[in-house]
Interface confidence: low
């Protein structure tokens, strides 16, 4: 056959769905590779052909559309289940051509099976609600393109395996369930079961997000540096280790970059020749507020080490904060024979 | 407590109409789809048809499309099933039966609380 | 329309008996299936739901399995209340077809 542009297994998105619910998926070429839309296409003449690979199988088939009550069809750059079942998992193809031009992209899709309480394989998008914050709400996604504005759906909404219904602070409100005020006990899987008639049958889609609750921007402090402090003096003889800690807390900001680091007379520990290393650990609050420490260590210490200026610095959205760690050379204990000695005065 | 009443049923001739109803108490009737189920005598359980809690969306089995009408009152928590052209195949105890919480299809509750239902007779 | 077929349509079996009934769809239902039960001259009541999760207040010796076709209903302990029809029902969408019934009885 003629050269046709091959982008290859799209595996950036792996599109999940669940079993038995409808499924609409766009040919990605138009989203991700190709600098046109789907209408621009069709009307220069090009024609989209779908074809799919079943799961452990090599052999490229083409997708049937004349399937009872047309379970699998073709609208514009949609592939549409209604619905899936489970051996629609595989790679699907979609090819863009006509005489002179083809481009082809595949992706995998996987039909996946869930339980009576929602769970399942399947990824879960979060949602992150800032604590206390006053009323907050979550929106079923990806249901837009399956029912025309005229039907009006019915919206179910469960907190793991429970129907939400004359809870304190959750309120299913059609499409969103409002939270109103968010607290550490509504953490959780949260579903929306979207349940349309379509040409005499009923369809379910089901919706699973993972909700958790976040330090709210209220309570949101520049970084605070705990170690090393004016407490703690790292006093050290040539040739120990010298180990020094910097500890900072952060608190939970949406989006915000934090970083811990160390100078070492204003460098950076890379642009200095001696042999020190730094590790780091993170932990995290329920509300996500954020620790990091990062151990600067000097295997074998000098006495030019112990002289220089260690700084510890930290930055996030909120601001930039520096302390220097108080480092000293242990004095060395008087050496008695040498000072009696001197004291009876031998020549 | 939870409990499902039907009443109405009776005997009538071949292609006359009837209405039954179902008195719903004891749970938030207007939060739940609804749906009649009929019996044959000495035969299997047949599903008739369902209405959403908001009226929005009703389905009924092939056999009695277009001479049967589903319908609610939520303000006196009842639901009807008016049944015109009535055959003798028809005939049948008639059940009402709570669906799922908000309509949501049957979507795991399935069908909880039937009536004790009421016998339906068409002959002539 | 989605057919729902039961096995066996009667049987006969000892107090203590393990009982096994079938059902099966046309086409795959995912986990959307319903076990009944009833006594002559009662109401159905439902058993089971989403195929294998027991109704509050149901005994334990009843119990579910299955998805997408092919669906079992287990009594593990045959006990003289049990004796009734079973039947299954498909609720995935519109018609909520019932499976013909399984009428169970004391040997």
């Known amino acids: 056959s003629e050269r046709c542009d091959d982008w290859g297994l799209d595996t950036m998105r792996q599109i999940q769905v669940f079993e038995d619910e409808p499924a609409r998926i766009k040919c990605p070429l138009f989203e991700h590779f190709l600098k046109f839309n789907y209408s621009t296409a069709h009307s220069a003449g090009l024609t989209l052909i779908w074809y799919w690979t079943r799961q452990d199988r090599d052999l490229e088939e083409p997708i049937n559309f004349r399937l009872p009550e047309n379970r699998i069809s073709k609208e514009k750059d949609v592939l549409w289940f209604r619905p899936t079942l489970l051996n629609d998992t595989g790679n699907y193809t979609c090819m863009l051509r006509n005489t002179t031009y083809c481009s082809k992209v595949a992706f995998p899709l996987e039909v996946v099976q869930k339980d009576s309480c929602f769970n399942s394989p399947m990824k879960l998008p979060v949602h992150k609600l800032y604590i206390e914050y006053g009323i907050q709400r979550i929106t079923c996604p990806n249901v837009d393109g399956y029912f025309p504005s005229s039907v009006k759906p019915t919206i179910t909404w469960y907190m793991g395996c429970y129907k939400i219904q004359n809870f304190n602070n959750v309120i299913p409100e059609g499409m969103n369930l409002s939270f109103l005020i968010a607290l550490i006990s509504n953490n959780g899987n949260y579903t929306c079961v979207v349940t349309y008639p379509e040409n005499g049958r009923t369809f379910h889609l089901t919706r699973t997000l993972t909700v958790k609750v976040v330090g709210s921007p209220k309570n949101a402090v520049p970084p605070v540096i705990h170690s090393p402090n004016d407490h703690v003096v790292y006093e050290k003889e040539p040739g120990e280790e010298l180990l020094i800690p910097c500890t900072v807390y952060f608190s939970f900001l949406m989006d915000s970059r934090n970083e811990v680091w160390w100078t070492i007379d204003g460098k950076k520990p890379d642009d200095i020749t001696i042999d020190v290393t730094i590790n780091e650990s993170i932990s995290h609050s329920r509300t996500e507020d954020e620790t990091r420490t990062q151990i600067l260590s000097i295997k074998k210490v000098t006495s030019e080490d112990l002289k220089r200026s260690y700084v510890c610095h930290a930055r996030s959205a909120k601001g930039e904060v520096a302390k220097a760690a108080k480092v000293k050379q242990k004095v060395p204990a008087p050496r008695y024979t040498v000072e009696l000695a001197c004291g009876f005065g031998a020549t | 407590q939870v409990q499902l009443v039907e009443s109405g049923g009776g005997v009538v001739q071949p292609g006359r109409s009837l209405r039954i109803s179902c008195a719903a108490s004891?749970?938030?009737?207007?939060?739940?789809?609804m749906h009649w189920v009929r019996q044959a005598p000495g035969k299997g359980l047949e599903w008739v048809a369902i209405i959403w809690h908001d009226e929005s969306y009703k389905y009924y089995v092939d056999s009695v499309k277009g001479r049967f009408t589903i319908s609610r009152d939520n303000s006196k928590n009842t639901l009807y099933l008016q049944m015109n052209s009535l055959r003798a195949e028809d005939t049948a105890v008639y059940y009402c039966?709570?669906?799922?919480?908000?309509?949501?299809?049957?979507?795991?509750?399935?069908?909880?609380?039937w009536g004790q239902g009421t016998m339906v007779t068409v002959s002539s | 329309d989605i057919q729902m077929t039961q096995s066996p349509s009667s049987l006969s079996a000892s107090v203590g008996d393990r009982v096994i009934i079938t059902c099966r769809a046309s086409q795959g239902i995912s986990n959307y299936l319903a076990w009944f039960q009833q006594k002559p001259g009662k109401a159905p009541n439902l058993l089971i739901y989403a195929a294998s999760t027991l109704r509050s207040g149901v005994p334990s010796r009843f119990s579910g399995s299955g998805s997408g076709t092919d669906f079992t209903l287990t009594i593990s302990s045959l006990q003289p209340e049990d004796v009734a029809t079973y039947y299954c029902?498909?609720?995935?969408?519109?018609?909520?077809?019932f499976g013909q019934g399984t009428k169970v009885e004391i040997k």
């Open positions: 039966a709570r669906g799922d919480y908000y309509g949501s299809g049957s979507y795991y509750d399935a069908f909880d609380i």
């Open positions: 004891g749970f938030t009737f207007r939060s739940y789809g």
């Open positions: 029902q498909k609720y995935n969408s519109a018609p909520y077809t």
